[in-house]
């Protein structure tokens, strides 16, 4: 059943989440900028077909529209999405020495955000079952594929975060 924005989420949790989304968006933008500057891979829309063939998935947030937000489902989808992106970012490891530190920080920040979401779900008695394993992750056959994958994963992640931010901001409104 839908739960309105005045649902049982503490303001401190929502503000922490908004902070974390902004931090990850900054990390993601830095990764995109470096991929563009170093490898001239600047337009994710040009790589969409390659993304399909590589099998890079999207994370849904269908339980999160502000008009009919289902709190448990939305938080669960947020957590599942972050779990998915942890795996996708892990698949990019070794992308290049120049991008390594940025990717490392992005990976940890995504993991920390997933922890924050899970912690709150646990406090509300709605923690999901632990996902035992990652689903099938894309296998990159070449350096180019890995870098192109980096552009797409960063782009998908940014889209996911934009929706997340809107949802969290909506929930944070009194």
């Amino acid at each position: 059943t839908p739960l309105g924005p005045a649902s049982s989420l503490p303001q401190s949790f929502l503000l922490k989440c908004l902070e974390q989304v902004r931090k990850i968006q900054g990390d993601g933008a830095a990764l995109q900028e470096k991929l563009c500057a170093t490898y001239k891979l600047c337009h994710p829309e040009e790589l969409v077909l390659l993304g399909h063939s590589l099998g890079i998935p999207w994370a849904p947030l269908s339980s999160c529209p502000s008009q009919a937000l289902q709190l448990a489902g939305c938080l669960s989808q947020l957590h599942s999405g972050l779990f998915l992106y942890q795996g996708l970012l892990q698949a990019l490891e070794g992308i290049s020495p120049e991008l390594g530190p940025t990717l490392d920080t992005l990976q940890l920040d995504v993991a920390d955000f997933a922890t924050t979401i899970w912690q709150q779900m646990e406090e509300l008695g709605m923690a999901p079952a632990l996902q035992p394993t990652q689903g099938a992750m894309p296998a990159f056959a070449s350096a180019f594929q890995r870098r192109a994958g980096g552009v797409l994963v960063a782009s998908h992640l940014q889209s996911f975060l934009e929706v997340s931010y809107r949802v969290l901001r909506h929930l944070a409104q009194p």
């Epitope: 902004r22 942890q86 530190p101 920390d112």
Partner: antibody, heavy 119, light 112 residues
Framework: QVQLVQSGAEVKKPGASVKVSCKAS????????MHWIRQAPGQGLEWIGY????????NYNQKFRDRATLTADTSTSTAYMELSSLRSEDTAVYYC????????????WGQGTLVTVSS | DIVMTQSPLSLPVTPGEPASISCRSS???????????LYWYLQKPGQSPQLLIY???NLASGVPDRFSGSGSGTDFTLKISRVEAEDVGVYYC?????????FGQGTKLEIK
């Protein structure tokens, strides 16, 4: 309450390896990253790396990338830090500390494990 | 890597007097989200470090309010308004803006 209990002190010869354990209790272990930090005698703190137990992903400080291996066993809620090709400069107290964001970061530490490397 | 530099390295203080420790980072720790990713830890003799202050100025749970943190993007200060005997130990600043996380060399506070 959250507790991190580390294995006991170790004495190793140069060139050997050491494996330190950190058993967690009082929280859902796979959900939090676990970091490892060391402190040489009379020195400051040095970040070694972290493990994300939920996906088995580890990340290392460049300085330790060739010699450190971080692992986690979710069935026993235990994190491990293995350091190979030990040298005298590796003599230090090794700590595990639970990760997180904001007020959660390194809010919980193990008691430390002294590793002495001596011939 | 971001380099964290503390001063002084040793700080003798009379109980009841104020104390101040400085920390400087080689890169701004102020993120575009408005948060400064600077932490302070205290390691009491024979103990593991404990969290004192997070995100430059927020007091960790259970930390007495005689402790306070302030600063800008690269220059930070930990203040103790009135030092007590239990405050002795080594104080570390640390950054968690980006990996690898790095710590200052530590400031040893001792009672005169």
């Amino acid at each position: 309450q959250v507790q991190l209990v580390q294995s006991g002190a170790e004495v190793k010869k140069p060139g050997a390896s050491v494996k330190v354990s950190c058993k967690a209790s009082g929280y859902t272990f796979p959900i939090y990253t676990m970091h490892w930090i060391r402190q040489a005698p009379g020195q400051g703190l040095e970040w070694i790396g972290y493990i994300n137990p939920s996906i088995g992903y580890a990340n290392y400080n460049q300085k330790f990338r060739d010699r450190a291996t971080l692992t986690a066993d979710t069935s026993t809620s235990t994190a491990y830090m293995e350091l190979s090709s030990l040298r005298s400069e590796d003599t230090a107290v090794y700590y595990c500390a639970r990760g997180g964001y904001g007020d959660s970061l390194f809010a919980y530490w193990g008691q430390g494990t002294l590793v002495t490397v001596s011939s | 890597d971001i380099v964290m530099t503390q001063s002084p390295l040793s700080l003798p203080v009379t109980p009841g007097e104020p104390a101040s420790i400085s920390c400087r980072s080689s890169k701004s720790l102020l993120h575009s989200n408005g948060i400064t990713y600077l932490y302070w830890y205290l390691q009491k003799p024979g103990q593991s470090p404990q969290l004192l202050i997070y995100q430059m100025s927020n007091l960790a749970s259970g930390v007495p309010d005689r402790f306070s943190g302030s600063g800008s993007g690269t220059d930070f200060t930990l203040k103790i308004s009135r030092v007590e005997a239990e405050d002795v130990g080594v104080y570390y600043c640390a950054q968690n803006l980006e990996l690898p996380y790095t710590f200052g060399q530590g400031t040893k506070l001792e009672i005169k």
